[in-house]
Each structure stands twice: as structure tokens, then as C-alpha cells.
């Protein structure tokens, strides 16, 4: 960053998107600002216009191509700049040499579905979205289940230390409504972080059979 009150953070989704957030104390809300991407070994440049997300924070997505195209590799370095208009000139407000595969944040898992549900158990599957083939199986997942009367923050985290796109939830209460979320993270990358949580999947366990012990 250019000065101590500016923060410029970007993540690569491993395929064709770099999402950036720029925070700047005292920055002008009306100023037009762009993120400019200049790869060291590619023939393209890319810009996106920063849009306000809060009083002193702006965000945009550098869309590098079709969603599933592999636009960057582990050896790429992309110079990312925040440029803001000052009159007829553009001033560099922040700059970083961005290593995409050291700053990964994948898309949230998609296509959550109940494979099988019983009174006390539920088998759920999901898919990863726009994840690079470079990872092979080097991914991990976290999952959480929302029980009645609790919040997501109270839900215990279940960790899957391998590329396993399903889970069998056990010790559930019969005839009870639950919600389930999952997120994914590559093992690679010093500054890599978890994906956003998936959209919640609602499901209900089956009622206990009448006259039987539960």
C-alpha cells in the first residue's frame, strides 16, 4: 500500500477471477478508481472499476475470461494497482506484486443436495465450483449444521482433511429441521483463505417410527 491508512487485498479464485477490496481512510466517495492488473508473462491487461461497499471500502472483480478457463498459473506474478482520478490525472493509491496461487480463495461450494436421510442421519453431497485442476485432490472442507434454537456461530465445525465432496451427519434428532453449509480451501498458498460458506441446504430428518424406541 502507498500509505499506512490504505489496505489493498486481493484473492484469486484459481481460474479466471481476482477479487479485490481496497480500504482507505478519508478517501473521497465520488472519486472514480480502478484496479489495474498487469501480468508479468501474459499479453493481456485487465481493469475493473472499484465500487463502494462501505464508507471507506471499495471492491471489484477482475474477470480474466470464461469462468472455467485457467488464466493464471503458479509461476505468474500480476502487478495490481489501485488508480484514482485526480482531475485529469490518475494517481496510484496502492500497488502489490500479486502471486495468484499464494492468495487463493475459491468460490463457495454449489449443488448441495440430500443424498439420503433417515431419523438420525443425513448424507449430503456438494460440488466445487471453478476450482483449478492444478489442485488435484489437495483440498480440504469445513462443514457446519444449524440446529433448532442455535446460531451458525454456535455450530461446531466439522473438518474434512481431504477432497471429499460428501458427508454423513449422525446423531441427529428425528423429525427436526436442520440447515447445512460447507466451505472449501486449497492446501496451497501462504495467504490462502477459506471460500465463502455455501448457500444453506435445509433438510428434515424422518420422524421416528411409532411405538419404537429412539
Amino acid at each position: 500500500a502507498v500509505n499506512g491508512t490504505s489496505q489493498f487485498t486481493c484473492f484469486y479464485n484459481s481460474r479466471a477471477n481476482i477479487s479485490c477490496v481496497w480500504s482507505q481512510d478519508g478517501a473521497l466517495q465520488d472519486t472514480s478508481c480502478q484496479v489495474h492488473a498487469w501480468p508479468d508473462r501474459r499479453r493481456w491487461n485487465q481493469t475493473c472499476e472499484l465500487l463502494p461497499v462501505s464508507q471507506a471500502s471499495w471492491a471489484c472483480n477482475l474477470i480474466l475470461g470464461a469462468p472455467d478457463s485457467q488464466k493464471l498459473t503458479t509461476v505468474d506474478i500480476v502487478t495490481l494497482r489501485v488508480l484514482c482520478r485526480e482531475g485529469v490525472r490518475w494517481r496510484v493509491m496502492a500497488i502489490q506484486d500479486f502471486k495468484p496461487f499464494e492468495n487463493l480463495r475459491l468460490m463457495a461450494p454449489i449443488s448441495l443436495q440430500v443424498v439420503h436421510v433417515e431419523t438420525h442421519r443425513c448424507n449430503i453431497s456438494w460440488e466445487i465450483s471453478q476450482a483449478s485442476h492444478y489442485f488435484e485432490r489437495h483440498l480440504e472442507f469445513e462443514a457446519r449444521t444449524l440446529s433448532p434454537g442455535h446460531t451458525w456461530e454456535e455450530a461446531p465445525l466439522l473438518t474434512l482433511k481431504q477432497k471429499q465432496e460428501w458427508i454423513c451427519l449422525e446423531t441427529l434428532t428425528p423429525d427436526t429441521q436442520y440447515e447445512f453449509q460447507v466451505r472449501v480451501k486449497p492446501l496451497q498458498g501462504e495467504f490462502t483463505t477459506w471460500s465463502p460458506w455455501s448457500q444453506p441446504l435445509a433438510f428434515r430428518t424422518k420422524p421416528a417410527a411409532l411405538g419404537k424406541d429412539t
Epitope: Q34, E49, A66
Partner: nanobody, 123 residues
Amino acid sequence: EVQLVESGGGLVQAGGSLRLSCVVSGDVFVRYTMAWFRQAPGKEREFVAAVTDSGRTTEYVDSVKGRFTVSRDNAKNTVYLQMNNLEPEDTAVYYCAANTDYFQIRSVDNNAWGQGTQVTVSS
């Protein structure tokens, strides 16, 4: 490879209006800053207007400010140029241009181009 197709040109009297459209295909539309250029007979192609990927920011050459409005519909992969209070000096072939780099859009060299649409303003 990105393809651009303009439409909406025609013959109009001075003081009239036209709306040009440019449909983009072959790539992700929101990657691109979009612009309109024009080329009058015997003259070089000149920048007219541009709109950023988000559509929030627009730019115009001084001679069209207050008369022309550039906009985009990212859901329809289309950029528009609304031209009001047209003058005979606006007569030209109007070209749609696309560039992934906002800072290169005014340059004629590195843009993707449409085939152009003729606008003729009679006095």
C-alpha cells in the same frame, strides 16, 4: 475472440436523435470497458465516449458532452450511444470498441472493433 456488432445508424435531420447499439459476443462482456469512436470522411478515427465495466463511470469528448449519453446493459451484453441534438458535424461512421484495459480504451491500436454503422445528419 470477442465480436462486436453495431446497429441503429441512419439519416436524420439536424436537431434529431438516434440511438446506436452494440452487441458483444464471444467473451465475458463485463471484462470490457466499452467505447464509441467515429470516423468522418477523410479524417482519422476519433474517440467519442466510453463506459467502464460496471457502467458507473462515463467519459466523453468535449464536442458531444451534454448531447450524447453512453450506457451499457450487462445483462444484454450491449452498449448504447444515445445521440440527441445531432449536428451535421456528427456525420461519420460510428464504431463500437472494446478493451479489457480501461487505460487503453482511447487508443485506436489495441481495441477490438465492430464493423461500424453510418450516421448522416442533414442540415
